[in-house]
C-alpha cells in the first residue's frame, strides 16, 4: 500500500447563500489526523498520536492552507450555475501518493451535492468528467470559472501536488505513519441463547496496518460468506484499527467452531470460550 | 481563565471617530479564534460589528464597513475598534467577545454615548 | 442579511414551570445557531452552540431544538436564577445576526 495524505473539504449554500468557513479533514495513510475547527477558525490534530508527534508549525502551516482552499472552494461554489433552491454542497477530496518505488501521484476530485463531476491529475492537469449531462455541465461551469482566474495555471497545479508531497513526506519522516506492525488483540464473546443458537462474535483491535483476515471456521474449514457478519475496518484513534466477525451456532458446538486471524504475515486461531 | 475588558472614552461628540480598547488576559489572540466588536443599542438590539481573526484577517458587518477599522497590538495582547464619523444613533454598551461563529467569552461592556 | 425573529418579546411563566422561546431565520441555517442569556447589567452568556449542544457548566434543564428555519430554546423546572432576556444568534454566513431577544419573567 502506497503511504498517502488526503484532505477532504466541504461547503454549503442554502438558497443561493455559500456559507462563512468550511469543513475539512485530513487523513495519513488513511487514518484521520487533522480536523479544521471553525470556532477556533484552525486546523487542529485529530488523534493523541497525531497531536504527540506533530508540532505546533505543522497546524499553522495546515490552517493557512485549508483556509486558502476553503476559500477557493467557496468562490467556486458561488460560480455553479445550477443552483436550486435548498441545501447544496461542494466537496473536494485531495490526494496524493508515495509508492514503494517512489513513484508519486496526485489527484483532486469534486463532488456537488455528494455526486462526482470532475477529477483532476496534477501531475499531468488531465481531467476526466462522468458521463451524466449534470456533471458535465458542472464540470465546464467550474472550469471556465478557473479559466477566468489567473492563479489557476499549470504551475499552480504542478505546486499543489508538490506542496502535498512536501507535507507527506515530513510527516513521514516525523514518524507518524512509519511502516510498522501492531498485531491485532484479538477477543471472542458469546451473546444469550436464542432457540438453541447463540451468536458469537470475534472482534480484533489496535492493529496496523489496515488489512487484515477475519473469519470463522467449523472443524478447521472457513464458514461460507452468507453464514458470517462482518464489522467494517475502522480506526480506533490511536493510528491503529478495529473490526469484527460474528456468527450463528447451535448451543453446545462452540469447541467446533474458531476464530482465524491473519494480519502482515502472521496467523492465529482462537477458540470459542466454554 | 480567559478574561476581556474593554476600555473607552464613554463620551464622544458627533463626527468624531471613536476608538475602543479589548484588553484579553489568559489567552493569546493570536493562537487562534476570532476577536469579535458586539454593540447593543437602548433598545437591546444586538449587533455584530466584524472581528480580527487570531491571524489578523479582518471581516466587517457591511452596514459598517466604510466607517469600521478593527486592528490590534499583539505584543500587549489587545486588539482595538474604531469608529468613524460617528452619529447619535451609535450609542449603545461595546462587548468584545471571542469566537469563529458563536461567541464563548465576552467583556463585561463599555457604554458609549454619541451627544454633542 | 439573515433576519432572526423572536415573535415574542415577553413571556410569563410559573416557577417549575416549562418554557419555549422560538427563532425563526430569513433563510434555512442549517443548525448554525446559538443561544444566549443575558441579565440586567451583564454580557450576554452562551447556552448553547449548533442548535443543540450545551455548553460546559451550563444547567441540564436547558435545551435546544430545531432545523431548517426554526428553532426552539426549552427550558424545564425553572428556576429564579433563569429571569433574563435569550437571544438566538447565527453563524451561517456573515454578518452573523442575532433576534431581537424573549425576556423571561416569573409570573
Known amino acids: 500500500e502506497p503511504h498517502s495524505l488526503r484532505y477532504n473539504l466541504m461547503v454549503l449554500s442554502q438558497d443561493g447563500s455559500v456559507q462563512s468557513g468550511f469543513l475539512a479533514e485530513g487523513h495519513l495513510d488513511g487514518q484521520p489526523f487533522l480536523r479544521y475547527d471553525r470556532q477556533k477558525r484552525r486546523a487542529k490534530p485529530q488523534g493523541q498520536w497525531a497531536e504527540n508527534v506533530l508540532g505546533a508549525k505543522t497546524w499553522d502551516t495546515e490552517t493557512e492552507d485549508l483556509t486558502e482552499n476553503g476559500q477557493d472552494l467557496r468562490r467556486t461554489l458561488t460560480h455553479i450555475k445550477d443552483q436550486k433552491g435548498g441545501l447544496h454542497s461542494l466537496q473536494e477530496i485531495r490526494v496524493c501518493e508515495i509508492h514503494e518505488d517512489s513513484s508519486t501521484r496526485g489527484s483532486r476530485h469534486f463532488y456537488y451535492d455528494g455526486e462526482l463531476f470532475l477529477s483532476q491529475n496534477l501531475e499531468t492537469q488531465e481531467s476526466t468528467v462522468p458521463q451524466s449531462s449534470r456533471a458535465q455541465t458542472l464540470a465546464m461551469n467550474v472550469t471556465n470559472f478557473w479559466k477566468e482566474d489567473a492563479m489557476k495555471t499549470k504551475t499552480h497545479y504542478r505546486a499543489m501536488q508538490a506542496d502535498c508531497l512536501q507535507k507527506l513526506q515530513r510527516y513521514l519522516k516525523s514518524g507518524v505513519a512509519i511502516r510498522r506492525t501492531v498485531p491485532p488483540m484479538v477477543n471472542v464473546t458469546c451473546s444469550e441463547v436464542s432457540e438453541g443458537n447463540i451468536t458469537v462474535t470475534c472482534r480484533a483491535s489496535s492493529f496496523y496496518p489496515r488489512n487484515i483476515t477475519l473469519t470463522w471456521r467449523q472443524d478447521g474449514v472457513s464458514l461460507s460468506h452468507n453464514t458470517q457478519q462482518w464489522g467494517d475496518v475502522l480506526p480506533d484513534g490511536n493510528g491503529t484499527y478495529q473490526t469484527w466477525v460474528a456468527t450463528r451456532i447451535r448451543q453446545g458446538e462452540e469447541q467446533r467452531f474458531t476464530c482465524y486471524m491473519e494480519h502482515s504475515g502472521n496467523h492465529g486461531t482462537h477458540p470459542v470460550p466454554s | 481563565e480567559v478574561q476581556l475588558e474593554e476600555s473607552g472614552p464613554g463620551l464622544v461628540k458627533p463626527s468624531q471617530s471613536l476608538s475602543l480598547t479589548c484588553t484579553v488576559t489568559?489567552?493569546?489572540?493570536?493562537?487562534?479564534?476570532?476577536w469579535n466588536w458586539i454593540r447593543q443599542f437602548p433598545g437591546n438590539k444586538l449587533e455584530w460589528m466584524g472581528y480580527i481573526s487570531y491571524s489578523g484577517s479582518t471581516n466587517y458587518n457591511p452596514s459598517l464597513k466604510s466607517r469600521i477599522s478593527i486592528t490590534r497590538d499583539t505584543s500587549k495582547n489587545q486588539f482595538f475598534l474604531q469608529l468613524n464619523s460617528v452619529i447619535t444613533e451609535d450609542t449603545a454598551t461595546y462587548y468584545c467577545?471571542?469566537?469563529?461563529?458563536?461567541?464563548?467569552?465576552w467583556g463585561q461592556g463599555t457604554t458609549l454615548t454619541v451627544s454633542s | 442579511d439573515i433576519v432572526l425573529t423572536q415573535t415574542t418579546s415577553y413571556l410569563s411563566v410559573s416557577l417549575g414551570g416549562r418554557v419555549t422561546i422560538a427563532c425563526k431565520a430569513s433563510a434555512h441555517i442549517n443548525n448554525w445557531l446559538a443561544w444566549y442569556q443575558q441579565k440586567p447589567g451583564n454580557a450576554p452568556r452562551l447556552l448553547i452552540s449548533d442548535a443543540t449542544s450545551l455548553e460546559t457548566g451550563v444547567p441540564s434543564r436547558f435545551s435546544g431544538s430545531g432545523s431548517g428555519k426554526d428553532y426552539t430554546l426549552s427550558i424545564t423546572s425553572l428556576q429564579t436564577e433563569d429571569v433574563a432576556t435569550y437571544y438566538c444568534q447565527h453563524y451561517w454566513s456573515t454578518p452573523w445576526t442575532f433576534g431581537g431577544g424573549t425576556k423571561l419573567e416569573i409570573k
Open positions: 489568559g489567552y493569546s489572540i493570536t493562537s487562534d479564534y476570532a
Open positions: 467577545a471571542r469566537g469563529g461563529t458563536y461567541f464563548d467569552y
